[in-house]
Interface confidence: low
Amino acid sequence: NKILVKQSPMLVAYDNAVNLSCKYSYNLFSREFRASLHKGLDSAVEVCVVYGNYSQQLQVYSKTGFNCDGKLGNESVTFYLQNLYVNQTDIYFCKIEVMYPPPYLDNEKSNGTIIHVKGKHLCPSPLFPGPSKP
């Protein structure tokens, strides 16, 4: 038996930050679980981890240098990624493992979310072109 995961097909990070919500066909309340976000078609880079246990504070961390935070809902985990670079535009996959209580469960691979990072272009506004040269 596998947990199903739903993700937005695409998100655009205009300000180098994005909220990616992973919605599960499973209620995480009173469960010990490890939710993670992976980058790339081969999910080679573990971007962020949310480790949950109903009797402990949520643990959120990244071992790969991403600036991330996480929030827990009954059937969802939302990853908040900040300071993304344009070259981190890629497909991102949600993963979930439920350790306790048994049986151990994980998810069917989701379709993923393409995160398109649009860099901040610090161009002068055409309405305020700045001082003109004499």
């Epitope: 010990e32 009797s55 493992e97 350790m99 048994p102 049986p103 151990y104």
Partner: nanobody, 118 residues
């Protein structure tokens, strides 16, 4: 280097009690589920009990449910198994194990022998 060192085994009469301990080192104890597994003489391994990282979630094999209690003290990096109402069929070497995922264990101790006999 991960090390798990069991203690507390011994000879006990049927109906008696024992408390096993497992001192863990070489990893962040509080980040991992732990388990007890046993092996009776001439038999295969039998899973006994699991405990979650915080100690609040526990699970037991039917053969020990209601008689054994698993617990942990994360401040002491120690896992425990309180065994009450012991029976002859509980005679086994008891191993402490670090949980990788549910009933998959990546590190084991050397074991402690529990003998239940009159």
């Amino acid at each position: 280097e991960v090390q798990l060192l069991e203690s507390g085994g011994g000879l006990v009469q049927p109906g008696g009690s024992l408390r096993l301990s497992c001192a863990a080192s070489g990893f962040t104890f509080e980040n991992y589920g732990m388990a007890w597994v046993r092996q009776a003489p001439g038999k295969g391994l039998e899973w006994v009990s699991n405990i979650g990282r915080a100690g609040s979630v526990t699970y037991y094999a039917d053969s020990v449910k209601g008689r054994f209690t698993i617990s942990r003290d994360n401040s002491k990096n120690t896992l425990y198994l309180q065994m009450n109402s012991l029976r002859a069929e509980d005679t086994a070497v008891y191993y402490c194990a670090k949980v990788q995922s549910w009933r998959t264990f990546d590190y084991w101790g050397q074991g402690t022998l529990v003998t239940v006999s009159s």
